[in-house]
C-alpha cells in the first residue's frame, strides 16, 4: 500500500484549511499556550511494524475528527471551511482504512498497538478537558488548532518514514 | 538544520529608508512567528514587535508602533523590517528570532546573526 | 506592559562558584518566563524556556526555577564559557520584555 501517494496531498489540505480556520488574532492568546503533552514517541516510527503505524495515524486523525466534530466547534469555526476539513479527514481516513486491509497477512505482528492508540486517546482527552475548563473560549480553540496543526506536521514526518519503508 | 539568516550590515543618513531582512530555512517557514529585537549599542535587549507569516499578522511593541513595519513573504521564506526614515537613534544591532506561535515549545530557540543598522550623517 | 527586574545588574565570581540571578515580574506571569545568554558581538541563546525547561544542548549546570512574580536562573558551577550576559524575559503577553541585564565577570 502506497500510503503516501494518496494520503499526503489531503494531509497537506488539511493543514491549509486548518491555517484558514482561525477567527481571532493569536496573538491575544500567549497566555492560554498549554503543555497537552504531545506523544511524540508514538509519532517517531521506529518500534513499528508499518501496520501498527497506520493504526496510530488513524486514531488521531479519528480523534480528530471527533473533536472538530463537537456542537461547541461547529459554533466557533466557519461552516464552509470546516465541512472542507471534515472531507479531507474522511479521505484520510478511508486511505488509510484500505492501507490496514492490505496489510492483513503481511506481517506477522498484530494490526494494532493497544499501548499506542491508548496514549493518543489519552493525548486527545486533554485536550478535551483543556476547552471545557476554559468554557470553549475562542483563545482556547486558537491554542487547540495550533496544537493539532503541529500533530498533523509531525504525523506527516511519520508518513514520510512509512514511504521510505516501502 | 535550522537557520535565520540576516542581510549584511548598513550604513545610512538620517531619513533615508531602510528595509533588512531574515530568511528563515530547515523548518516549515509558517509554523513559527518571526519577531524582532533591538539592541542599542552596549545596552540591552528590545522587543520591536512579531508577524506570523501564515497571514502577516503583525503585533508591535508600543515604543515602536508607526516607527518600522515588520513585513514577510512566506513564498521565500523571508521576514523583514523596515523604516521609511531613519533617525540616528535607530543606529542598533537588529536581531530576528523564530517564536513557536501558540505552541508549548521555547521561544526564540533560533536567533539570525544579527543586522546592525548605523544612521548617521 | 509588564516589567522586568533582574539582580543584580553584575555580579563576579570565579570558575567553579554557584551563581544565582533573580528576575521579577511587575505582576504574576505564572511559568511565562525565558533565561537567555548573550556574549559580546553575538546573538542572544535560549537557555531556559517556561521557567525550568533546559533547551535542547544547553549544559546541565544551568537550572531555572520560580512561578508567578519571582525566578532564579543558577549556574551550579560557572566554567570560563559562562561569562556572558544573562536576560530573563516574559512570554505571557504582548508586549514581550525583557530584564536589564546580569553581567557576569571573572573575578
Known amino acids: 500500500c502506497d500510503l503516501p501517494q494518496t494520503h499526503s496531498l489531503s494531509n497537506r489540505r488539511t493543514l491549509m484549511i486548518m491555517a484558514q480556520m482561525g477567527r481571532i488574532s493569536p496573538f491575544s492568546c500567549l497566555k492560554d499556550r498549554h503543555d497537552f503533552g504531545f506523544p511524540q514517541e508514538e509519532f517517531d516510527g521506529n518500534q513499528f511494524q508499518k501496520a501498527q503505524a497506520i493504526s496510530v495515524l488513524h486514531e488521531m486523525i479519528q480523534q480528530t475528527f471527533n473533536l472538530f466534530s463537537t456542537k461547541d466547534s461547529s459554533a466557533t469555526w466557519d461552516e464552509t471551511l470546516l465541512d472542507k476539513f471534515y472531507t479531507e479527514l474522511y479521505q484520510q481516513l478511508n486511505d488509510l482504512e484500505a492501507c490496514m486491509m492490505q496489510e492483513v497477512g503481511v506481517e506477522d505482528t498484530p494490526l494494532m498497538n493497544v499501548d499506542s492508540i491508548l496514549t493518543v486517546r489519552k493525548y486527545f482527552q486533554r485536550i478535551t478537558l483543556y476547552l471545557t475548563e476554559k468554557k470553549y473560549s475562542p483563545c482556547a480553540w486558537e491554542v487547540v488548532r495550533a496544537e493539532i496543526m503541529r500533530s498533523f506536521s509531525l504525523s506527516a514526518n511519520l508518513q514520510e518514514r512509512l514511504r521510505r519503508k516501502e | 538544520e535550522v537557520q535565520l539568516v540576516q542581510s549584511g550590515a548598513e550604513v545610512k543618513k538620517p531619513g533615508e529608508s531602510l528595509k533588512i531582512s531574515c530568511k528563515g530555512s530547515g523548518y516549515s517557514f509558517t509554523s513559527y512567528w518571526i519577531g524582532w529585537v533591538r539592541q542599542m549599542p552596549g545596552k540591552g535587549l528590545e522587543w520591536m514587535g512579531i508577524i506570523d507569516p501564515s497571514d502577516s499578522d503583525t503585533a508591535y511593541s508600543p515604543s515602536f508602533q508607526g516607527q518600522v513595519t515588520i513585513s514577510a513573504d512566506k513564498s521565500i521564506s523571508t521576514a523583514y523590517l523596515q523604516w521609511s526614515s531613519l533617525k540616528a537613534s535607530d543606529t542598533a544591532m537588529y536581531y530576528c528570532?523564530?517564536?513557536?506561535?501558540?505552541?508549548?515549545?521555547?521561544?526564540?530557540?533560533?536567533w539570525g546573526q544579527g543586522t546592525l543598522v548605523t544612521v548617521s550623517s | 506592559d509588564i516589567q522586568m527586574t533582574q539582580s543584580p545588574s553584575s555580579l563576579s565570581a570565579s570558575v567553579g562558584d554557584r551563581v544565582t540571578i533573580t528576575c521579577r515580574a511587575s505582576?504574576?506571569?505564572?511559568?511565562?518566563l525565558n533565561w537567555y545568554q548573550q556574549k559580546p558581538g553575538k546573538a542572544p541563546k535560549l537557555l531556559i524556556y517556561f521557567a525550568s525547561s533546559l533547551q535542547s544542548g544547553v549544559p546541565s549546570r544551568f537550572s531555572g526555577s520560580g512561578s508567578g512574580t519571582d525566578f532564579t536562573l543558577t549556574i551550579s558551577s560557572l566554567q570560563p564559557e559562562d561569562f556572558a550576559t544573562y536576560y530573563c524575559?516574559?512570554?505571557?503577553?504582548?508586549?514581550?520584555?525583557f530584564g536589564q541585564g546580569t553581567k557576569v565577570e571573572i573575578k
Open positions: 528570532a523564530r517564536h513557536p506561535g501558540l505552541n508549548w515549545a521555547p521561544d526564540f530557540d533560533y
Open positions: 524575559q516574559q512570554s505571557i503577553d504582548f508586549p514581550l520584555t
Open positions: 505582576q504574576s506571569i505564572a511559568e511565562f
